[in-house]
């Protein structure tokens, strides 16, 4: 069969080769492969200013294989697509486009955001945090004794970091003023860190107020509960002065 095709092609192409290389069924010196052996894909390969036919077992990047009865070729993906499964389903987009459901888009649809690493449109992920851990013991300068007024803190973990368009994380640290019965430090206690001692329960009537840690506040979006107008702030300062325990500003 190959020989008969070779003879026939000679009529259209005077310099048809009898023995074709690399999977060609018929070929010519000028055009390269004219047709391919079964299961191989015909493709045009640019060599300088010239395009020649080649027969490939799989198609190069930017092309997908189309199979029709006894005739296969490499077909170009769409202009905005780098690799594709077929004409209508892209698997990797060209630079500047984002992949979404097999299509390449300039911008991601509503409710999705661009992942600039994978170049895909992905769901927006909001921050998730754990419940607060218990308050730490009341300490001052790292000690749990030898003072009346100190601070205690509590923390919570970020379970899920937000994506670019997701809600930012709320504060993960909170610090508040606390009071303890003034007691002298025993030998060996001096300098012991609060976390090494059992947490002392506050005395009856002790008032405490949580103050979010400034570092975690800076990185968060304003949370409605934290909003206060200036009048409310002044009012609170007056009330706080009247209380036996003062509340510090965010530090």
């Amino acid at each position: 069969q190959n020989a008969s095709r070779g003879r026939r092609q000679r009529r259209m192409h005077p310099n048809v080769s009898q023995g074709c290389q690399g999977g060609c069924a018929t070929c010519s010196d000028y055009n390269g492969c004219l047709s391919c052996k079964p299961r191989l894909f015909f493709a045009l390969e640019r060599i300088g200013m010239k395009q020649i036919g080649v027969c490939l077992s799989s198609c190069p990047s930017g092309y997908y294989g189309t199979r029709y009865p006894d005739i296969n070729k490499c077909t170009k993906c769409k202009a905005d697509c780098d690799t594709c499964f077929n004409k209508n389903f892209c698997t990797k987009c060209k630079s500047g486009f984002y992949l979404h459901l097999g299509k390449c888009l300039d911008n991601c649809p509503e409710g999705l955001e661009a992942n600039n690493h994978t170049m895909e449109c992905v769901s927006i992920v909001h921050c998730e945090v754990s419940e607060w851990n218990p308050w730490s013991p009341c300490t001052k300068k790292g000690k749990t004794c030898g003072f009346k007024r100190g601070t205690e803190t509590r923390v919570r973990e970020i379970i899920q970091h937000p994506s670019a368009k997701g809600n930012l994380c709320p504060p993960t640290n909170e610090t508040r003023k606390c009071t303890v019965q003034r007691k002298k430090c025993q030998k060996g206690e001096r300098g012991k860190k609060g976390r090494e001692r059992k947490r002392k329960k506050p005395n009856k009537g002790e008032s405490k107020e949580a103050i979010p840690d400034s570092k975690s506040l800076e990185s968060s979006k304003e949370i409605p509960e934290q909003r206060e107008n200036k009048q409310q702030q002044k009012k609170r300062k007056v009330q706080d002065k009247q209380k036996s325990v003062s509340v510090s500003t965010v530090h």
Epitope: Q1, S4, M12, A25, S35, D70, K76, A79, K87
Partner: antibody, heavy 119, light 107 residues
Framework: EVQLVESGPGLVKPSETLSLTCTVS????????WNWIRQPPGKGLEWIGY???????YQNPSLKSRITISRDTSKNQFSLKLSSVTAADTAVYYC?????????????WGQGTLVTVSS | DIQMTQSPSSLSASVGDRVTITCKAS??????LSWFQQKPGKAPKTLIY???RLVDGVPSRFSGSGSGQDYTLTISSLQPEDFATYYC?????????FGQGTKVEIK
């Protein structure tokens, strides 16, 4: 030189089946791809389908349900059957061949045969 | 299916004129384009394949160019025997589709 000659009735009644044969000389239909193309009077060309060197066929989806393309290798002929014809199927029907993507497309044509659909 | 839009649908020219016919595909057809010449009552004749390759025996005044979606057939110096209808054909995928044709008439 490859030659293709179409033959078949020039007149077909509506709802009947149009049958044409293309006889090939100068090459074997067991190589290449053998096509049917039609051209309504005063209009453009429409590709109908092909039968390959192995006998596999592919038809234009717009006509697929009505088309049958077959071959007889012993006579070096291939045929077209188009069922349930209407006046819109009145056209000159051509057979033509190509050998692969790297060579001339429809390098050889038959002279064409006019088929009129009329009662 | 890929649509082929050919223009102009007809043109009048004189012998010796340079004539250009264009074909625009509805999507990138990657150079898989042929041009045909058809005279009244005759079968079409292949002039050019793979955008710019001349079929053996076709005069060199015929040339093809283009890429992507846009393709052109140029007749550098129109001869009396060139008055005919010209069609483009894409064969990037099946079904194959032809342009509507351009009739080149004597001015």
């Amino acid at each position: 030189e490859v030659q293709l000659v179409e033959s078949g009735p020039g007149l077909v009644k509506p709802s009947e089946t149009l049958s044409l044969t293309c006889t090939v000389s100068g090459d074997s239909i067991t190589s290449g791809y053998w096509n049917w193309i039609r051209q309504p009077p005063g209009k453009g060309l429409e590709w109908i389908g092909y039968i390959s060197y192995s006998g596999k066929t592919y038809q234009n989806p717009s006509l697929k349900s009505r088309i049958t393309i077959s071959r007889d290798t012993s006579k070096n002929q291939f045929s077209l059957k188009l069922s349930s014809v209407t006046a819109a199927d009145t056209a000159v029907y051509y057979c033509a061949t190509y050998y692969g993507y790297g060579g001339p497309w429809f390098a050889y044509w038959g002279q064409g045969t006019l088929v009129t659909v009329s009662s | 299916d890929i649509q082929m839009t050919q223009s102009p649908s007809s043109l009048s020219a004189s012998v010796g004129d340079r004539v250009t016919i264009t074909c625009k595909a509805s999507q990138d057809i990657d150079s898989y384009l042929s041009w045909f010449q058809q005279k009244p009552g005759k079968a079409p004749k292949t002039l050019i394949y793979l955008t710019n390759r001349l079929v053996d025996g076709v005069p060199s005044r015929f040339s093809g160019s283009g890429s992507g979606q846009d393709y052109t057939l140029t007749i550098s110096s129109l001869q009396p025997e060139d008055f005919a209808t010209y069609y483009c054909l894409h064969y990037d995928e099946f079904p194959l589709t032809f342009g509507q044709g351009t009739k080149v008439e004597i001015k």
